[in-house]
């Protein structure tokens, strides 16, 4: 209430920009925790089945857009078939699993390796069988998968008929798609995320055509591809909350992703404003309709009139509401390269705190699992990855801090990644694993990299200790 | 302050294209808020909006009017224009050119507006 | 046709109070935001309300907007004869893809 008052702004995000150490919930002062994360507190790690896979038309795998992308619009990358090969070498990811002791692994299913051209008709059985396996074995480990339903690879067959993203049929196919993986895999699945940061998907890949399926300048295929990533997830929400939450009893997010920006004046009520906007128009976006009030922010609905889908009144109620938790993820992805429009003259910042604190004070306080953290190497750098131990140490104290100091609700933290593996537009000119993998060897050994270890410690004293 | 002037011949003969051109002062047509518009209103009857370019090039039309409308922007000279083809009598109208603006503030619509040009269509 | 349904014309004399009711649908008043113009005889229109219910500056606040689902309403208080004009109501509709005016409203006053 206090907050509300002082700053006259109406207890939204806008409040973390003010610099008055009475009333900003980031108390800036306090640099560095020693200190424990609450107990049960959730550590995990993640992959990109596209990133990770590796055999792309192996065994009855479909090809995905960026299988197609990859060949029609990345220089000097031939597939993704060598990548880490986790496909061939499931083993191999799980005893780097063991080797840091994480308490749940996120993964997402590559729907082109179940469905070839997306339709739900006979699932291809190795594709199944795949990964049917790893749920066994992460079951038998004790450690909880969190599955992603959609990490960007969309079955070619899909674009190639109806458009992709653009074209609202896809949300019932998708929905299908759910289903069968409710059914098959929801006995062991007890967090699931629809779609993996639908920002990028429509910005990159209907925008700056960075990703796949490579379709650039029309912003109108942008707010439509994200208007139907919006109701995709909300019908799946639907469809998990009615036919199998109640045997199944998991839960079910979509992950949202996003930058963090400072203004130039701190002290400028413009700069502000504009650092608001920024938010909005990512992070907003997306959250807006599924953890706020089931419609798009108002500041958006105003400037994009002319190329924004509305909702009816029906949808909105139907969108509000359809997450779980709120899956945050806060990587290179969402920094570089920036969208200028979102960047609105402000300057990009990592604080993942104030991140935080931003979606606390717009969503009233949600319970988050960061579903995506961590930063990058030089593809040159192997197992000594200095910078990214001092990148994973800065984001995790933060998130203590917010824990801790701003009583934010973060349950689980997701190091990413396990492997090094492909990373979309860079290929593989950078490295985001844990563990180190040598695309150019047959056996793709894991080596467990610096990060690897210091992570293993920080889950094995549950934070920082003196 | 923001001023709108139409340009272009008053009589247009049928089956000919209509061309107008639109020059701006104290704001650029490059800007990022603005939608630069023409409208039409017929002898003793309403406003018809014909369609609108944003500064990126993008540009949405009226519907009915959509196979013979092209309006395009020229930055060098802070102008844009309307083409309207294959006119009949029924479009003889005074033709408005317009700001539509809209920023995350506030929706204004048309907030500028020329003083309008007669267009007569007649053999 | 007009796809915003305005009346043709209202009255009433100098002092009095009067309002001018448009009415649309959910794909365009419902879920955009409003504009009202006014049309002197042999001018251009000119921008009377925005957002619904802002005045931009220089229009007396005689004039104000008001939006309740897929209607709105453009009050004129204290009648003068200079009011005398063409009122249109304008928004954007989402389905059509298009800007969308009120077939106008004529203003007499008595």
């Known amino acids: 209430i206090l907050l509300r008052a002082v700053t006259g702004f109406s207890g939204d995000g806008r409040a973390i920009w003010s610099k008055n150490p009475n009333f900003t919930p980031v108390n800036e002062s306090q640099l560095f925790l020693y200190d424990t994360f609450p107990k049960n507190f959730f550590w995990g790690i993640g992959t990109g089945a596209l990133q990770v896979e590796g055999s792309w038309k192996k065994d009855g795998k479909g090809p995905s857009i960026w299988d197609h992308f990859i060949h029609t619009h990345l220089k000097n990358v031939s597939s993704t078939n060598g990548s880490s090969d986790s496909y061939i070498f499931l083993e191999k990811d799980l005893s780097a699993l063991d080797f840091i002791g994480v308490s749940f692994y996120q993964f997402s299913i590559s729907w082109p390796r179940l469905f070839p051209d997306g339709i739900v008709t006979v699932a291809n059985a190795k594709g199944l069988q795949y990964y049917s396996t790893l749920l066994d074995a992460l079951v038998l480990r004790n450690i909880e998968p969190i599955v992603t339903l959609y990490h960007w690879d969309l079955p070619l067959a899909l674009q190639e008929k109806y458009g992709g993203w653009k074209n609202d049929t896809i949300i019932d196919i998708f929905n299908d798609y759910a289903t069968y993986c409710f059914q098959m895999f929801g006995d062991r699945v007890k967090y699931w995320i629809t779609i993996h940061n639908p920002y990028l998907v429509a910005w990159h890949g209907y925008g700056t055509g960075m990703h796949a399926p490579g379709e650039k300048g029309n912003l109108a295929a942008v707010y439509t591809v994200g208007h139907n990533l919006i109701k995709a997830h909300s019908k799946v929400w639907h469809n998990y909350n009615t036919h199998f939450r109640p045997h199944q009893k998991g839960w079910l997010s979509i992950t949202l992703g996003s930058h963090w920006i400072e203004p130039n004046r701190s002290e400028n009520t413009m700069d502000i404003f504009k650092c608001q906007q920024s938010m909005v128009s990512v992070l907003g976006w997306f959250a807006n309709p599924i953890h706020g009030d089931g419609d798009y922010p108002e500041g958006m609905r105003k400037k994009l009139f002319s190329v924004l889908p509305i909702f009816s009144e029906a949808e909105k109620h139907e969108m509000r509401g359809t997450a779980d938790f709120f899956a945050f993820s806060f990587g290179p992805n969402n920094f570089k390269p920036l969208n200028t429009m979102a960047k609105m003259g402000q300057n990009v910042s990592l604080n993942l705190r104030e991140a935080l604190n931003w979606i606390k004070l717009e969503y009233n306080n949600p319970r988050i699992l960061i579903a995506e953290n961590g930063w990058f190497t030089d593809s040159r750098v192997k197992t000594e990855d200095t910078t990214a131990i001092y990148m994973m140490k800065n984001f995790l104290s933060q998130v203590l801090q917010a824990i801790r100091l701003d009583e934010i609700r973060v349950f689980g933290y997701t190091a990413w990644s396990l492997l090094d593996g492909f990373e979309w537009q860079d290929a593989y000119t950078i490295r985001r694993g844990l563990f180190y993998v040598d695309f150019n060897s047959k056996q793709k050994e894991r080596k467990p990299k610096s990060s690897a270890h210091y992570y293993k410690q920080i889950i094995r004293e549950n934070g920082f200790s003196l | 302050q923001v001023q709108l002037q139409e340009s272009g011949p008053g009589l247009v003969k049928p089956s000919e294209t209509l061309s107008l051109t639109c020059t701006v002062s104290g704001d650029s047509v490059s800007s990022g808020d603005n939608y630069w518009s023409w409208i039409r209103q017929p002898p003793g009857k309403g406003l018809e909006w014909i369609g609108f370019?944003?500064?990126?090039?993008?540009?949405n039309y009226n519907p009915s009017l959509k196979s013979r409308v092209t309006i395009s922007l020229h930055t060098s000279k802070n102008q844009f224009s309307l083409r309207l083809s294959s006119v009949t009598a029924a479009d003889t109208a005074v033709y408005y050119c317009?700001?539509?603006?809209?920023?995350?503030?506030?929706?204004?619509?048309?907030?500028?507006w020329g003083q309008g040009t007669t267009v007569t269509v007649s053999s | 046709q007009s796809v915003l349904t305005q009346p043709p014309s209202v009255s009433a004399a100098p002092g009095q109070k009067v309002t001018i009711s448009c009415s649309g649908s959910s794909s365009n008043i419902g879920n955009n935001y409003v504009s009202w113009y006014q049309q002197l005889p042999g001018t251009a229109p000119k921008l009377l309300i925005y957002d619904n219910n802002k005045r931009p500056s220089g229009i007396p606040d005689r004039f104000s907007g008001s939006k309740s689902g897929t209607s709105a309403t453009l009050g004129i208080t204290g009648l003068q004869t200079g009011d005398e004009a063409d009122y249109y109501c304008g928004t954007w509709d989402s389905s059509l893809s298009a800007v969308v005016f009120g077939g106008g409203t004529k203003l007499t006053v008595l």
């Open positions: 317009g700001r539509y603006r809209s920023d995350w503030d506030y929706y204004y619509g048309m907030d500028v």
């Open positions: 370019m944003f500064y990126s090039g993008s540009t």
